[in-house]
Interface confidence: medium
């Protein structure tokens, strides 16, 4: 081409302005409203309406003129309610009376099917600490817990650890101020993500894996009940709930002496076909490197806040970025993949199955995941959970984007990073980070209190617009946050991942570990090697920064080699010493299992607080493997094998 024909170079300020102007003319509420019309609601995973919406999204992607649009089919097992209703009853100890409390409208997927009878004990939110603080032992008893604070799966796992025989979950009016006390709700109890019957491997139709079962499935029955049902149970219980629980005055602690509660759950397994829909805008320089932007499509109830907002953001961002590329001269270096997942309600099943299908290669290609789920749950606060690799990007974006109502910058607290909450099991970004080692971010505009209607039949567009009258403005701000992430990640020559941020994470871990140096010495162990590994990691990051500074930004080959080193950082924090099948969430910082740094610290604490539960051999293993994982990350970041100091 002649120089005259060259596309003018677009800079960050040009692209930021372009994005902002396009979003100003986007009608998000109409799209959200459309996604909540009768033809798409309710859309439980695998249902006809879920498939209808999948087709619609696929067509929209095609109309956006994305470079390529495709779909993945998975065959997964979910649990649905049986025609025989689940029930909660109160009986006399000698069965002299039986009183039906409720046949609940909702249910908890992946509950154990069983009928259990026993006394009922209130365990607040069902956190580990809540169980520790209880006066009444729960072994052999059912427990009733409030929704909120932690996932249903964690509540059930904690109850099971305390030897409870069943779990009831309700929404108290204090935390969930819903007028209608009979509202039913839904959740799942799989302490993990993906299809729990194909743990660690994908559920494509042609993959003949032997029967298997996730260790994160519960072995006790669990059921959601309405607030009205909980109040009927409380009428048959005694002992006021502690005032520091800050719950309803009707709350009671334990069933009366002569009464028992019976829980009967008979859900059924169902194999369903789910569709993940994808579209891509191909990068102009490195099309094989991509940022993935995803949203859950399915929903047990109407799912306005849970899945319609995220899906609307996905569709509008696809349209916006396609226009920027096709009409306005934006030439992203790297690709952008738009993904609509199904079966999110059952534990990020669609997203995880995709990750499992490409486990060996995805971390070499996908360098960031941006989750759009539940991005708008309120107006007051902007909250974010992410890999530390993305903190610098997030901070820059917060400084650039204005709050949709106050007009002030989203960056109001220089200490925001220390308040970031870990990604949890119920977030689609979690498996990207903890299972696949791909940096991931999830964010929301929200209130201090939970959005009360998630997972209920009241998660309608009507309630959403009533709770958030300025929905269009807030959705626009959410799109601008995601859009700026996307531009910065695909446009800049140097990959926008702050690999140096893990230095402070490692330092923080070592500080915590150092509190127990006396215990470590008593076991004849030393932290020298761990400090050495941390030092090597620090030196590797410094060297990489120097390499970037000294490199010619126009030398694509050199930049690609440096960027590839950055891309591997997150992945190398996945413990290579545990099996993805047995411990899928291998990340030593953000995963779950005994290989994590937090598990190592919790275990070491037991040496003082509960010595009988402390296992020195296990601890020695934990320390050695953590050290080697960190050392491995340092080595990977250093570059070629002949550059690595092997004195270690």
């Amino acid at each position: 081409k002649d120089d005259d024909d060259k596309v003018p170079q677009l800079y960050w300020d040009d692209l930021k302005k372009m994005l902002s102007e396009k979003l100003d003319t986007t009608d998000f509420t109409s799209t959200i409203k459309l996604l909540n019309e009768n033809s798409y609601v309710p859309r439980e995973a695998g249902s006809q309406k879920d498939e209808n919406l999948a087709w619609y999204i696929e067509n929209q992607f095609r109309e956006c003129k994305l470079s390529k649009v495709w779909r993945d089919e998975h065959f997964v097992k979910i649990q649905v309610k049986d025609s025989a209703q689940n029930s909660v009853t109160i009986t006399g100890t000698n069965s002299e009376f039986v009183y039906l409390v409720e046949n609940p409208g909702g249910y908890v997927a992946y509950s154990q099917n069983a009928t259990v009878t026993g006394k009922l004990v209130h365990a607040n939110f069902g956190t580990e600490k809540d169980f520790e603080d209880l006066d009444s032992p729960v072994n052999g008893s059912l427990v009733i817990v409030r929704a909120g604070k932690i996932t249903f799966a964690e509540k059930v796992a904690n109850a099971e650890s305390a030897n409870a025989i069943g779990v009831l979950i309700y929404m108290d009016k204090t935390k969930f101020p819903i007028v209608d006390a009979d509202v039913s709700f839904f959740g799942h109890a799989h302490l993990g993500t993906g299809d729990p019957y194909t743990p660690g491997f994908p559920s494509f139709n042609h993959t003949q894996f032997p029967p298997s079962r996730s260790s994160g499935l519960p072995n006790i029955p669990v059921q959601t009940i309405s607030r009205a049902a909980a109040e009927r149970l409380f009428e048959n219980m005694e002992g006021d709930c502690p005032s520091d629980w800050k719950t309803d005055s009707s709350c009671r602690m334990v069933t009366s002496q002569n009464k028992s509660v019976k829980l009967s759950v008979s859900n059924v397994m169902k194999e369903i076909k789910i569709l993940n829909i994808f579209g891509v805008i191909k990068g102009f320089v490195e099309p094989d490197r991509y940022v993935v932007v995803g949203a859950q499509r399915d929903s047990w109830g109407p799912g306005a806040a849970k899945s319609s907002v995220g899906t609307a953001l996905l569709l509008e961002l696809a349209q916006t970025f396609s226009d920027m590329v096709l009409k306005d001269g934006f030439q992203p270096s790297r690709s952008i993949v738009f993904a609509s997942w199904s079966a999110g309600d059952f534990g990020s099943v669609g997203a995880t199955e995709w990750l499992e299908g490409y486990l060996s290669s995805l971390h070499l290609k996908a360098f960031t995941f941006i989750n759009l789920d539940k991005a708008v749950l309120g107006t007051s606060n902007f909250r974010v959970s992410a890999s530390p690799l993305l903190y610098a990007l997030i901070e820059k974006t917060m400084q650039e984007v204005k709050h949709p109502v106050t007009g002030l910058s989203l960056y109001q607290d220089s200490n925001w990073a220390s308040k970031v909450e870990k990604l949890t099991f119920d977030n689609a970004a979690f498996p990207f980070l903890a299972y696949s080692g791909i940096p991931a971010v999830s964010f929301c505009f929200c209130e201090d209190t939970d959005y009360p209607y998630l997972g209920t039949t009241m998660d309608t567009y009507k309630e959403l617009i009533e709770k958030i009258p300025q929905l269009n403005k807030v959705a626009r701000a959410a799109a601008e946050v995601a859009g700026q992430f996307m531009i910065k990640l695909t446009h800049d020559v140097e990959l926008n991942l702050d690999y140096e941020r893990y230095n402070s994470q490692l330092l923080s871990f070592l500080r915590n570990l150092n509190q127990y140096r006396a215990d470590i010495r008593e076991m004849g162990l030393s932290l020298q090697w761990l400090y050495s590994a941390r030092g090597d990691f620090f030196r590797a990051t410094s060297r990489l920064t120097t390499d970037f500074k000294n490199s010619e930004k126009t030398d694509r080959f050199v930049m690609k080699e440096l960027n590839d080193r950055v891309m591997k950082v997150e992945y190398y924090f996945l413990s290579p010493y545990v099996s993805p099948r047995e411990s899928p969430f291998r990340h030593i910082f953000w995963g779950s299992g005994s290989h994590t740094l937090s598990a190592l610290l919790e275990h070491l604490k037991l040496r003082k607080t509960n010595n009988r539960a402390f296992n020195e051999t296990l601890f020695r293993n934990q320390l050695a493997l953590a050290t080697w994982t960190i050392q491995g990350a340092a080595n990977a970041l250093s570059g070629d094998i002949w550059d690595i100091d092997n004195e270690f």
Partner: antibody
Framework: EVQLLESGGGLVQPGGSLRLSCAAS????????MNWVRQAPGKGLEWVSG????????NYADSVKGRFTISRDNSKNTLDLQMNSLRAEDTAVYYC???????????????WGQGTLVTVSS | SYEVTQPPSVSVSPGQTASITCSGH??????ACWYQQKPGQSPVLVIY???KRPSGIPERFSGSNSGNTATLTISGTQAMDEADYYC?????????FGGGTKLTVL
């Protein structure tokens, strides 16, 4: 003070065209969706068309789809309704109405103009 | 297409409570609002989002919406409340008005 002033009404023959305008003042025009609502003599209210604050999204009643076009000029704070292929049943007072928020998403019409009469007759 | 139905007329004595209904399939799942229109005047919004009152509208006007019916209630009806009342909702991307109810204060 919010003001909406319609103009452009009058007598027109069946099959003819007419362009209604609504001049808005007293609020940030581009931040609000706008609508046209009509009322035939002695009859009830009938929604005709709506447009989002940016002008990117437009909607029409089935009875006027393909014949009427709604548009806005945010630099001039005006809302227009181009009416083609007019029929006798289009005879009505046409009101311009401001929506409470910038996007047509279950928001009420909090301000109305005084209306302009359109008569379609031969 | 979606329709909402109102009674053509309702009569009430001064000081009494007037109730005007608006019915439509699963109307409670949608928002309803109400407009008052006096002869020769433009409509005025009196209730929005089922039960909210714009500033300047007297407290005697209230609204509710559940099941298939939205209701506008005027307690302690005054002669000045005599007017046509229209309920309005949304279906898909269109705005739906009821046929209107003439409230007569006897």
């Amino acid at each position: 003070e919010v003001q909406l002033l319609e103009s452009g009404g009058g007598l027109v023959q069946p099959g003819g065209s007419l362009r209604l305008s609504c001049a808005a003042s007293g609020f940030t025009f581009s931040s609000y969706a706008m609508n046209w609502v009509r009322q035939a003599p002695g009859k009830g209210l009938e929604w005709v068309s709506g447009i989002s604050g940016s002008g990117v999204s437009t909607n029409y009643a089935d009875s006027v789809k393909g014949r009427f076009t709604i548009s806005r000029d945010n630099s001039k704070n005006t809302l227009d309704l181009q009416m083609n292929s007019l029929r006798a049943e289009d005879t009505a007072v046409y009101y311009c109405a401001k929506e409470d928020y910038d996007s047509s998403g279950y928001y009420p019409f909090d301000y109305w103009g005084q209306g302009t009469l359109v008569t379609v007759s031969s | 297409s979606y329709e909402v139905t109102q009674p053509p007329s309702v009569s009430v004595s001064p000081g009494q409570t007037a109730s005007i209904t608006c019915s439509g399939h699963k109307l409670g799942d949608k928002f309803a609002c109400w407009y008052q229109q006096k002869p020769g005047q433009s409509p005025v919004l009196v209730i929005y989002q089922d039960r909210k009152r714009p500033s300047g509208i007297p407290e005697r006007f209230s609204g509710s919406n559940s099941g298939n019916t939205a209701t506008l209630t005027i307690s302690g009806t005054q002669a000045m409340d005599e007017a046509d009342y229209y309920c309005q909702t949304w279906y898909s991307s269109t705005v739906i008005f009821g046929g209107g109810t003439k409230l007569t204060v006897l």
